[in-house]
């Protein structure tokens, strides 16, 4: 029978008695930076080319006995998971292996850097099709390693890495913390985070998605026909490298940003039990398990968006947090979140010729997060329209006044520490969906975009009684671009997008003791692109 992990990543329409997705990733080359491998294992023989690259530290301990099958164990298994003929994800992908980990699975930053440079030079000397680089390793945070990953990613290479097996915040490790890298956590057959002894998969905002990573059957270096079960975020990353190879083989022109958005879009949503993660990491950790798209030709017509969380601002009074989109993505909205509820909102601002999302901490606050909604919107022209605090009691409002521009997101930011605590909420007049409304003490920022065929609509969900969480989702065919709370409720901790749902969080009502300002309204801006839909119909 088909191994559980291959079944898990396969959409139902492919599920027969065997795992045979349409294209095996044959146009893609996957580089594996790991241990040495047993290239004559029948699972990978002829599929993996062992390069002459080797840069590893000496093994620890004077009594270490170098045994070939042990030296090759990790790398052989991962090569099998990516492209093995029997238990591999991308059965058509060809691989090249570089040895950067020794027989004890240890490597150095310098060895990995030189390995990445070797790949870059190989790419320049002999350009081939799409390249995927699998980095199934994790070490302490390294600015220089992250920078090297960024350079390679900007040269058009897709990098996939393990989140790490330390049951810790992946942002503390490299290359997992590099924003340009696709960082993968591990889940088991029950879609739960993988526990490894006393540790387990890493988590947090630096993880892009999870993938099968427990009891993964793959080639064993023990013998030419041997198979073994291994676990960890390396195995999970290998699945995503295989899925990426399949996607790139079907659509070789995909950019890194497009690939990442598709990986997120086609993932299984909200299946992971978040209770496994530390409480402060649950909101930051994506509840996504990787899967193959249901057809080889991706949804080019779809408006793809993802949520990017910033690092925590820290508790100082003027602290800010910044969330950024990838170079090829558009920032369509910006929101903020604070566990204490003490924040001064957020704003979209230009930085280095690109919009970023900045959130502001408030006096006595424990710190804030900025949350960017980053979307793929070809030929987009976006700008931010700002209205300063209003004099009138009706509150501040701003709309998209340029012809053909539509509202994709609303932000509000205020200077005063305690914004309108005892004022009733401002009600937006009906029939004016193309505008943002806020407190009169706040400046309001509207994200306004023009793109061919782009249309957006506002959707609200209000609850009169106090609730810890209010949500509103965009319907099928529409994509959430903006998420905010209607002003007036001081107990709102913030708003953020989870997949296609806008979530507004409020302070635990039992602690506020407030009833007069109980109403909470979540406001979603849902968009779609008719232009992209038409373009895809013409292509078929």
């Amino acid at each position: 029978s088909i191994p559980w992990n291959l079944e898990r990543i396969t959409p139902p329409r492919y599920r027969a008695d065997e795992y045979q997705p349409p294209d095996g990733g044959s146009l893609v080359e996957v580089y594996l930076l790991d241990t040495s491998i047993q290239s004559d294992h029948r699972e990978i023989e002829g599929r993996v080319m062992v390069t002459d690259f080797e840069n590893v530290p000496e093994e620890d301990g004077t009594r270490f006995h170098r045994q070939a099958s042990k030296c090759d164990s990790h790398g052989t298994h991962l090569a099998g998971v990516v492209s093995g003929r029997d238990a591999g994800v991308a059965k058509g992908a060809s691989m090249r292996s570089l040895r950067v980990l020794n027989c004890q699975g240890k490597g150095t930053v310098s060895g990995t850097l030189i390995g990445l440079e070797f790949i870059r030079k190989s790419q320049l000397v002999q350009p081939v099709g799409p390249l995927v680089v699998l980095l199934p390793l994790a070490g302490g945070y390294s600015r220089v390693l992250n920078a090297a990953c960024q350079r390679l990613a900007r040269a058009g290479v897709v990098l996939v890495t393990a989140a790490g097996n330390f049951r810790d915040d992946a942002c503390l490790y490299s290359p997992a913390s590099a924003p340009e890298v696709i960082t993968v956590g591990a889940t088991n057959a029950q879609d739960q985070p993988v526990t490894l002894g006393t540790l387990g998969t890493n988590f947090g905002r630096c993880v892009d998605l999870f993938a099968p990573g427990e009891d993964i059957i793959g080639a064993s270096s023990d013998c030419s026909t041997c198979f073994v079960s291994q676990s960890g975020t390396s195995q999970a990353a290998a699945h995503v490298a295989g899925i990426a190879a399949m996607m790139l083989s079907a659509e070789p022109e995909l950019t890194l940003a497009e690939l990442r958005q598709r990986l997120i879009h086609f993932s299984a949503k909200d299946v992971i039990n978040e209770a496994w993660f530390p409480e402060d990491q649950r909101v930051l950790t994506p509840n996504l398990v990787a899967a193959l798209p249901p057809s080889t030709h991706g949804a080019g017509w779809q408006l793809f968006c993802r949520t990017v969380w910033s690092a925590h601002s820290g508790p100082t009074r003027m602290a800010t947090a910044v969330a950024r989109c990838a170079p090829d993505e558009e920032l369509l909205s910006c929101s903020s979140f604070s566990r204490s509820g003490k924040r001064r909102g957020e704003r979209m601002e230009a930085q280095g010729g690109k919009l970023v999302c900045r959130a502001h901490n408030a006096f006595g606050g424990e710190g804030v997060y900025a949350i960017a909604r980053c979307c793929l919107l070809p030929q987009a022209n976006c700008s931010v329209h700002t209205a300063p605090p209003a004099e009138a009691s009706m509150g501040t409002r701003v709309h998209c006044h340029q012809q053909g521009h539509v509202l994709t997101g609303c932000s509000s930011h205020w200077e005063v520490e305690d914004l309108g605590t005892h004022k009733p909420p401002v009600l937006r007049p009906r029939g004016q969906p193309n505008q943002c409304v806020g407190h009169r003490e706040a400046s309001i920022h509207a994200s306004c975009c023009h793109a061919p065929g782009l249309e957006c609509k506002v959707k609200e969900h209000g609850i009169p009684a106090p609730q810890e969480q209010v949500t509103v989702a965009c319907e099928e065919g529409w994509t959430l671009t903006g998420c905010s709370a209607l002003p007036g409720t001081s107990h709102v901790l913030g708003a953020y997008a989870v997949d296609n749902t806008c979530v507004v969080r409020s302070r635990d009502v039992s602690t506020t003791g407030s009833t007069s300002e109980g109403a909470v309204t979540a406001v979603a801006i849902c968009c779609r692109s008719r232009h992209l839909a038409q373009a895809s119909q013409e292509l078929q």
Partner: antibody, heavy 119, light 113 residues
Framework: QVQLVQSGAEVKKPGESLKISCKGS????????ISWVRQMPGKGLEWMGM????????HYSQNFQGQVTISADKSISTAYLQWSSLKASDTAMYYC????????????WGQGTLVTVSS | DIVMTQSPDSLAVSLGERATINCRSS????????????LAWYQQKPGQPPKLLIY???TRESGVPDRFSGSGSGTDFTLTISSLQAEDVAVYYC?????????FGQGTKVEIK
């Protein structure tokens, strides 16, 4: 049911070419390896090589490398063993057998093809 | 190459008696990663293809009578027919399937005494 059906007996002259076949049915042909095994008259079993029909990957025993060619046509679930120039010493019974990554032993065998090479 | 050596070459046993065939590999076929012995036993009757009896050194293939059993580990293995029946007259082969080339023992012919 699962079976491997081989082509019929052949009588050939030295120097002639030959291609014998093994057709799989009752299972997913591309998920299993097909091996060829030789048994010379009154002798034991010798593994010649194998093919993975999914991607036509082959692996030969050193003793048979260059002497025979193993191929497959997955569209008709058939594996082949061929000689470009037969020798009298190729006279033998040839069996095909299948195996799987999770069961890498030969659980199903063809009925055998007897090849006789004689001038 | 892993060399498989069977003993004896032939064996004559009375009906209902125990038949024991030994097989030795030139190197271990037991692998630590999954703790399995990559060894199988086959039965070949005259004019027929071989038939799988035992795999992983001791697991009986479905449909094989329970009088057939396999034992051993590492390099030394045994096939036992606990009570020989007339239909068990055949040549028996051991095979290692861990390394290429896949190799068979030379065979042991079992007859009725």
């Amino acid at each position: 049911q699962v079976q491997l059906v081989q082509s019929g007996a052949e009588v050939k002259k030295p120097g002639e070419s030959l291609k014998i076949s093994c057709k799989g049915s009752g299972y997913s042909f591309t998920d299993y390896y097909i091996s060829w095994v030789r048994q010379m008259p009154g002798k034991g079993l010798e593994w010649m090589g194998m093919i993975y029909p999914g991607d036509s990957y082959t692996h030969y025993s050193q003793n048979f490398q260059g002497q025979v060619t193993i191929s497959a046509d997955k569209s008709i679930s058939t594996a082949y063993l061929q000689w470009s120039s037969l020798k009298a010493s190729d006279t033998a019974m040839y069996y095909c057998a299948r195996d799987h990554w999770s069961r890498p032993f030969f659980d199903v065998w063809g009925q055998g093809t007897l090849v006789t090479v004689s001038s | 190459d892993i060399v498989m050596t069977q003993s004896p070459d032939s064996l004559a046993v009375s009906l209902g008696e125990r038949a024991t065939i030994n097989c030795r590999s030139s190197q271990s076929v037991l692998y630590s990663s999954n703790n399995k012995n990559y060894l199988a036993w086959y039965q070949q009757k005259p004019g027929q293809p071989p038939k799988l009896l035992i795999y992983w050194a001791s697991t009986r293939e479905s449909g094989v009578p329970d009088r057939f059993s396999g034992s051993g580990s590492g390099t030394d293995f045994t096939l036992t027919i606990s009570s020989l029946q007339a239909e068990d007259v055949a040549v028996y082969y051991c095979q290692q399937y861990s390394s290429f080339p896949i190799t068979f023992g030379q065979g042991t012919k079992v007859e009725i005494k």
